[in-house]
Interface confidence: medium
């Protein structure tokens, strides 16, 4: 989890801190959304279950040239134990359903808030 602290944390951070910072970043994205996020780019929907961090990263990594989600992509990579590259897909993707990045972020945020409340930090 070393990279999860962004610029504020030079070394490894506790999972609870990492998850909170990810949530704060997603909140920030939804708050500051003036124009359509990432120009309305569509991404594969995912099942919000075990392994969802890698699945979320696999979806979002296919969005290029969108600075608004770059920090989120970096943070998600800290939660995913393996390297993720564009075009990679797991069974957690709902392959027949694409949604806008903005909706994807809102859905992910809602789920992460629930996990945080329940103390599921890993």
């Amino acid at each position: 989890l070393t990279c999860l602290g962004g610029f504020a944390s030079p070394g490894p951070v506790p999972p609870s801190t990492a998850l909170r910072e990810l949530i704060e970043e997603l909140v920030n994205i939804t708050q500051n959304q003036k124009a359509p996020l990432c120009n309305g780019s569509m991404v594969w929907s995912i099942n919000l279950t075990a392994g969802m961090y890698c699945a979320a990263l696999e979806s979002l990594i296919n969005v290029s040239g969108c600075s608004a989600i770059e920090k989120t992509q970096r943070m998600l990579s800290g939660f995913c134990p393996h390297k993720v590259s564009a075009g990679q897909f797991s069974s957690l993707h709902v392959r027949d359903t694409k949604i806008e990045v903005a909706q994807f972020v809102k859905d992910l945020l809602l789920h992460l808030k629930k996990l945080f409340r329940e103390g599921q930090f890993n």
Partner: antibody, heavy 121, light 107 residues
């Protein structure tokens, strides 16, 4: 005991400045987002500003944007509100309030006792 | 901005009465809603968080329900110490907004 204690309130003339402080104790201050909330005499509650745990995310109510600045010093377990260009309508009791786990999650679980700010000539 | 409306604005009740206060949000806020009790000259005290979770130390006669846009605070059997003003708060998105409050006084 988990506690928040505000200070710095007082009487100030319109256009003047004031700096409020909120001292936190009994919990790991750096792990919590913080807010300022105010209440004008005889009125309801109004959220004023929010600051995240590591300073990166800050939000303000439109009514104070450009005039108030929220900040925190995690080393001193303290939250601040710098209030400039004060107006009569800023007269209120100012409370600091903790976010239970940050990032809008289960907000405002702990409140201070409040500090009164009066803006009058 | 999300607007919060509360009803009724005030009510008179007797000890032992069941009291219900409603809060409506102008758009969906999930369960990002809290209920607060405030007595004159005191800071607000949280009763309910996440729309329906009871704050530790708060008597079980208080309960919350709802999600999305409509929420309810219920006091199953009003006690003398419950006479106060009650506020709802949405913390789903900034600016956070409080309801205008419901004053509960003695009939």
């Amino acid at each position: 005991e988990v506690q928040l204690v505000e200070s710095g309130g007082g009487l100030v003339k319109p256009g003047g400045s004031l700096r409020l402080s909120c001292a936190a104790s009994g919990f790991t201050f750096s792990s919590y987002s913080m807010n300022w909330v105010r209440q004008a005499p005889g009125k309801g509650l109004e959220w004023v500003s929010y600051i995240s745990t590591s300073y990166n995310y800050i939000y303000y109510a439109d009514s104070v944007k450009g005039r108030f600045t929220i900040s925190r010093d995690n080393a001193k377990n303290s939250l601040y509100l710098q209030m400039n260009s004060l107006r009569a309508e800023d007269t209120a009791v100012y409370y600091c309030a903790r976010d239970q786990v940050g990032a809008t999650l289960d907000a405002f679980d702990i409140w201070g006792q409040g500090t009164m700010v009066t803006v009058s000539s | 901005d999300i607007q919060m409306t509360q009803s009724p604005s005030s009510l008179s009740a007797s000890v032992g009465d069941r009291v219900t206060i409603t809060c409506r949000a102008s758009q969906g806020i999930g369960d990002d809603l809290g209920w607060y009790q405030q007595k004159p000259g005191k800071a607000p005290k949280r009763l309910i968080y996440a729309a329906s979770s009871l704050q530790s130390g708060v008597p079980s006669r208080f309960s919350g329900s709802g999600s999305g846009t409509e929420f309810t605070l219920t006091i199953s059997s009003l006690q003398p110490e419950d006479f106060a003003t009650y506020y709802c708060l949405q913390h789903n998105s900034y600016p956070f907004t409080f309801g205008p409050g419901t004053r509960v006084d003695i009939k």
